[in-house]
């Protein structure tokens, strides 16, 4: 008789990343009998929800259900019906919602309640929506990339399965850039972590890790831009802001009320003699870089060394994966290659920012103008943050790997979050059996 294929014994999980600028849904899949093995979970789908981040729905909460529909229906299609009731769904909200909660806990709670109400309508095993801490965001990003890079596996391999993998078990640091916050997470070399808030202890697969992490709220690329504008408009002589971070010929009107809407600009807030001002781009990388540096307070440090704003940062150690907006921005600028030195990146940024806006629009006709206009700022901000903020140097630049995906799974906090909540990262090394049950089939 002909052998009949056994039904695939797999499990699925869904994580929604409710970021400050948008929400993405990720579907993960793994073999049911290998739950505790490292590296078996992989992403099968990413669905980007059309529209802004959930914090923008504060005045229109009843639109949240419709907003989430397309991606949740996509999940219904991708995951076999027989698995729906067993598939956990998690939603983690990040810095956009942290900022909303700072403004009003009641409004943030209302948004989350309506999000939960909407997600509960689907036939999955919904586990709730919550605002994750910056520390969690950093930690789960670090877990994700090291899980996908095979760093937690105790088996040493003579071949490399992923592009960035070195044969040693040294973990990668994680650099995450969002719209409203940025995280830095790594294992320092024999260095005590001087501030308890930045210290994490993990035991994963039988090994102990002492991890440093910090999340800089308001230092995601979008909030950093608002900060810079609020800082610069203070010293503008009129309602024209000549801005070196935008291309020559670029013009945009900004409402002062929008500028001061975010808690991130509170420290720069002042009464202005106008309700609107116009940004006029002058496209000068060096001046843009200088303006950005003013956002980092490096004059005060109560520790042996700091990143900025008095936040402890140990000496950088090992290789780093830079993902999320670090990757998207550098990818757009064609600067993700391992061969591009920091000096070359700076040169390219100088040229890019100096290009006239009309020329840029023609060269990148398919890109939305709102995003296109901000790449000069974002690229310059990334360089400023990595070099002056985190103290990377021209030499250590080569240890930064701009990563979008690893083995087909997006680098980011969502996979680590799901692995943790589904208890799929054991503290101890699982007992290895010579043959799995499936071998006997």
């Amino acid at each position: 008789t002909q052998n009949k294929a056994l039904p695939e014994n797999v499990k699925y999980g869904i994580v929604l990343d409710a970021g400050s600028s948008h929400t993405s849904l990720y579907i993960y899949k793994w073999p049911a009998e290998k739950e505790n093995d490292t590296g078996v979970v992989h992403q099968v789908e990413e669905c980007r929800v059309k529209g802004p981040g959930i914090s923008k729905f504060v005045q229109k909460v009843n639109e949240i259900g419709i907003y989430l529909t397309d991606c949740m229906e996509r999940a219904r299609e991708v995951i076999p019906r027989s698995q729906h009731q067993e598939t956990p769904v998690y939603l983690g909200a990040t810095a956009g919602m942290r900022l909303l909660r700072m403004e009003s806990e009641e409004l943030a709670d209302r948004v989350l309640d309506v999000v939960e109400r909407s997600l509960s309508n689907y036939p999955f095993d919904f586990q709730g929506a919550r605002i994750i801490t910056g520390q969690e965001e950093g930690a789960y990003g670090w877990i994700t990339i090291n899980y996908l890079l095979g760093k937690f596996s105790q088996k040493t391999r003579w071949f490399s399965i992923v592009p960035y993998e070195t044969n040693n078990q040294e973990t990668f640091g994680a650099l995450d850039l969002g719209g409203a916050s940025t995280q830095v997470t790594f294992v320092p070399q024999n260095q005590t972590i001087e501030s308890p808030d930045n210290a994490l202890q993990f035991r994963l697969y039988g090994k102990d890790y002492n991890v440093y992490t910090h999340s800089f709220l308001c230092y995601g690329k979008d909030q950093a831009l608002w900060q810079k504008l609020a800082k610069d408009i203070q010293v503008a002589s009129n309602e024209i802001l000549r801005d070196p971070c935008f291309h020559p010929g670029y013009k945009k009107v900004v409402n002062v009320s929008d500028l001061y809407k975010t808690p991130c600009t509170k420290r720069f807030e002042m009464t202005l003699p106008f309700q609107q001002f116009e940004i006029q781009g002058i496209g000068n990388y060096q001046q843009c870089h200088q303006s950005i540096l003013e956002l980092f307070n490096t004059s005060y440090c109560p520790y042996s060394q700091c990143a900025f704003n008095g936040i402890f940062l140990p000496p950088l150690q090992g290789d780093f994966g830079a993902f999320s907006a670090f990757y998207f921005v550098m990818k757009f600028l064609n600067l993700t290659s391992e061969k591009v030195s920091q000096e070359k990146v700076t040169e390219m940024m100088k040229k890019f920012c100096a290009q006239p806006w009309e020329e840029i629009k023609t060269s990148y006709a398919g890109v939305k103008e709102k995003y296109l206009s901000e790449y000069c700022f974002s690229g310059t901000y990334i360089l400023s943050l990595l070099l002056q903020g985190y103290h990377f140097t021209a030499d250590s630049w080569e240890h930064i790997h701009f990563i979008g995906k690893i083995q087909g799974s997006d680098a980011g906090w969502t996979l680590g979050y799901m692995l943790n909540l589904t208890n799929m990262i054991p503290a101890e090394q699982p007992l290895s059996t010579p043959l799995s049950h499936s071998t006997y089939v």
Epitope: G65, E106, D109, R110, L112, D113, E116, R117, L119, S120, N121, Y122, P123, D125, F126, Q127, G128, A129
Partner: antibody, heavy 119, light 107 residues
Framework: DVQLQESGPSLVQPSQSLSINCTVS????????VHWVRQSPGKGLEWLGV???????DYNAAFMSRLSITKDNSKSQVFFKMNRLQADDTATYYC?????????????WGQGTLVTVSA | DIVMTQSHKFMSTSVGDRVSVTCKAS??????VAWYQQKPGQSPKALIY???YRYSGVPDRFTGSGSGTDFTLTISNVQSEDLAEYFC?????????FGAGTKLELK
């Protein structure tokens, strides 16, 4: 074992208020929303309102002006109050919850409390 | 408000029969429909959610189908304990609304 139990008066005078307590066990009110539904021979099942786990509420617009739902997480109690009752508010009042945090269909119901509005 | 119409107030059946209870929504509710069974003096019990997913512990003779505006609860091989009233409910939008019920009785 998830349980919900309503307790309140069986008889209310017209134009007076109705207060019902729903005491829950087997789950935490900080993790789940609790709904209120009533049932009468004349109007069938009617959804009245819900208090979500974080404390925000949604009410049926038909009852909003006279309905209030609050809770005390530490006591595992949900409080239902309806003002200005009339004869057609005579019904069995249920508290109910879904299978997940905020499900809007009901896997668990209390036994119900029959309330008669009469002079 | 969305009106859920159960056109049959009563339906007659015999043990072992197959019976279908229908429910119509006044507007599209996707698959956000639940079905309940209620026996005299008891609270409603959930049978089906998301139009076609059986709630845990519900016998597989109960099946739900439909989407949009038309929904059906089918009981194949009716048992005597199935003689009860059946309600549909939409949870696509607020306020949540129920059908008026269909009472299943013996022929």
């Amino acid at each position: 074992d998830v349980q919900l139990q309503e307790s309140g008066p069986s008889l209310v005078q017209p134009s007076q208020s109705l207060s019902i307590n729903c005491t829950v066990s087997g789950f935490s009110l900080s993790s789940y929303g609790v709904h209120w539904v009533r049932q009468s021979p004349g109007k069938g099942l009617e959804w009245l309102g819900v208090i979500w786990r974080r404390g925000s509420t949604d009410y049926n617009a038909a009852f909003m002006s006279r309905l209030s739902i609050t809770k005390d997480n530490s006591k595992s109690q949900v409080f239902f109050k309806m003002n200005r009752l009339q004869a057609d508010d005579t019904a069995t009042y249920y508290c109910a919850k879904g299978i997940s945090t905020a499900t809007s269909w009901f896997a668990y119901w209390g036994q119900g409390t029959l309330v008669t509005v009469s002079a | 408000d969305i009106v859920m119409t159960q056109s049959h107030k009563f339906m007659s059946t015999s043990v072992g029969d197959r019976v279908s209870v229908t429910c119509k929504a006044s507007q599209n509710v996707g698959t956000n429909v639940a079905w309940y069974q209620q026996k005299p003096g008891q609270s409603p019990k959930a049978l089906i959610y998301s139009a076609s997913y059986r709630y845990s512990g519900v016998p597989d003779r109960f099946t739900g189908s439909g989407s949009g505006t038309d929904f059906t609860l089918t009981i194949s091989n009716v048992q005597s304990e199935d003689l009860a009233e059946y309600f549909c409910q939409q949870y696509n939008s607020y306020p949540l609304t129920f059908g008026a019920g269909t009472k299943l009785e013996l022929k």
